[in-house]
């Protein structure tokens, strides 16, 4: 299947809370952060916006014609291409309880298609042949998804908030929960 593509624009996807640390709303709105609410995090920590652009999952909008052999769609379709990386953010308070962010290495994420949509297109063929209808599957949205433990190279697992697990021999404190990767999240493959 051939494509004639024209890049239009891009939309940045900020991963959902629990998927990867990103700037909390308080920082974006320049509100003062409360030490108790943030697990003892100091209030002076600014979020460096270069980390967002450097590691964001972007939806690139492409307008293109669907082709099938000599036939081409009467109108172009708009599809998303997932681009960018879901990578490290500065150590931020909203990461508390959602992952052991202080570790030097952690869950690997990929920016990949999240939802698809089916669209019916009409293909026009040369030589006066009758138009043909065809259904195509187009990417509707992108998402950061976690690489999982067993690999058949086919699928990525959604990664929600991790199950809290107190440090061995320690009483759990609600403001700073340790979170080990939930084994249930590790059953599908990348």
């Amino acid at each position: 299947q051939g494509w004639q593509a024209f890049k239009n624009d891009a939309t940045e996807i900020i991963p959902e809370l629990g998927e990867y640390p990103e700037p909390p709303p308080e920082l974006e709105n320049n509100k003062t952060m409360n030490r108790a609410e943030n697990g003892g995090r100091p209030p002076h920590h600014p979020f460096e916006t270069k980390d967002v652009s450097e590691y964001s999952c972007r939806e690139l909008h492409f307008t293109r014609y669907v082709t099938d052999g000599q036939c081409r769609s009467a109108k172009p379709v708009t599809e998303l291409v997932c681009s960018g990386q879901c990578g490290p953010a500065r150590l931020l308070p909203n990461a508390i309880g959602r992952g052991k962010w202080w570790r030097p290495s952690g869950p690997d994420f990929r920016c990949i298609p999240d939802r698809y949509r089916a669209q019916r297109v009409q293909l026009l063929c040369p030589g006066g042949a009758a138009p043909r209808a065809r259904k195509v599957r187009l990417v509707a949205s992108c998402k950061c998804k976690r690489l999982t433990r067993f690999h058949n190279q086919s699928e990525l697992k959604d990664f929600g908030p991790e199950a809290a697990r107190p440090q061995k021999g320690r009483k759990p404190r609600p403001r700073a929960r340790g979170a080990k990767a939930n084994q249930a999240e590790l059953e599908n493959a990348y």
Partner: antibody, heavy 119, light 110 residues
Framework: EVQLVESGGGLVQPGRSLRLSCAAS????????LHWVRQAPGKGLEWVSG????????DYADSVKGRFTISRDNAKNSLYLQMNSLRVEDTALYYC????????????WGQGTTVTVSS | QSVLTQPPSASGTPGQRVTISCSGS????????VNWYQQLPGTAPKLLIY???QRPSGVPDRFSGSKSGTSASLAISGLQSEDEADYYC???????????FGGGTKLTVL
């Protein structure tokens, strides 16, 4: 200039204790997670322990669990490693290292302090 | 025996491209980000690559990292004499609940 300076190393007998310190300067100490990494003579790197901004955020390597304790004092810009029940195999150059990007590697390192465990 | 496996040595001539491999398992490289460190003789390690393929500021773009499945690799293009060092890969291991390093690769520039 970002700097980590380790101290407290020395010669100690097996079974004894030692406390390592790491003094930080040139950056906002509380913004960093801190770690101890060691390197035995002529060998590779071995991660020992790590701590977030308080002591609910701690990890240890199996080889030191129950013997070593990591802690930090944000008021003093210092990281510590209390090493008890020392073994000959704990002999190494101990580095203090830090990261301030979640899951982003150890981007600040000290020059290390030598611990020798021998009878 | 290291959890992550690296070749003990690698070599190349100035200007050449060399690649250092790092092999792991599903519990480390397979599911977590990979970091690479450079240790010049007699000095402390330095972060070279984080998050599989990201370079900290100050690291030349001659260094690049990649990851596929349970393996990772570090590529150095336009090899220079000052690249002669030990290189270590590292990743978190979910089974060991520990940050694990490869055994290190000694790179010699001929």
């Amino acid at each position: 200039e970002v700097q980590l300076v380790e101290s407290g190393g020395g010669l100690v007998q097996p079974g004894r204790s030692l406390r390592l310190s790491c003094a930080a300067s040139g950056f906002t100490f509380e913004d960093y997670a801190l770690h101890w990494v060691r390197q035995a003579p002529g060998k590779g790197l071995e991660w020992v322990s790590g701590i977030g901004w308080d002591d609910d955020m701690i990890d240890y390597a199996d080889s030191v669990k129950g013997r070593f304790t990591i802690s930090r004092d944000n008021a003093k810009n210092s990281l510590y490693l209390q090493m008890n029940s020392l073994r000959v195999e704990d002999t190494a150059l101990y580095y203090c290292a830090g990261n301030n990007r979640g899951y982003g590697g150890l981007d600040v390192w000290g020059q290390g302090t030598t611990v020798t465990v021998s009878s | 025996q290291s959890v992550l496996t690296q070749p003990p040595s690698a070599s190349g001539t100035p200007g050449q491209r060399v690649t250092i491999s790092c092999s792991g398992s599903s519990s480390n490289i397979g599911s977590n980000t990979v970091n690479w460190y450079q240790q010049l003789p007699g000095t402390a390690p330095k972060l070279l690559i984080y998050n599989n393929n990201q370079r900290p500021s100050g690291v030349p773009d001659r260094f690049s990292g990649s990851k596929s499945g349970t393996s990772a690799s570090l590529a150095i293009s336009g090899l220079q004499s000052e690249d002669e060092a030990d290189y270590y890969c590292a990743a978190w291991d979910d089974s060991l609940d520990s940050y694990v390093f490869g055994g290190g690769t000694k790179l010699t520039v001929l």
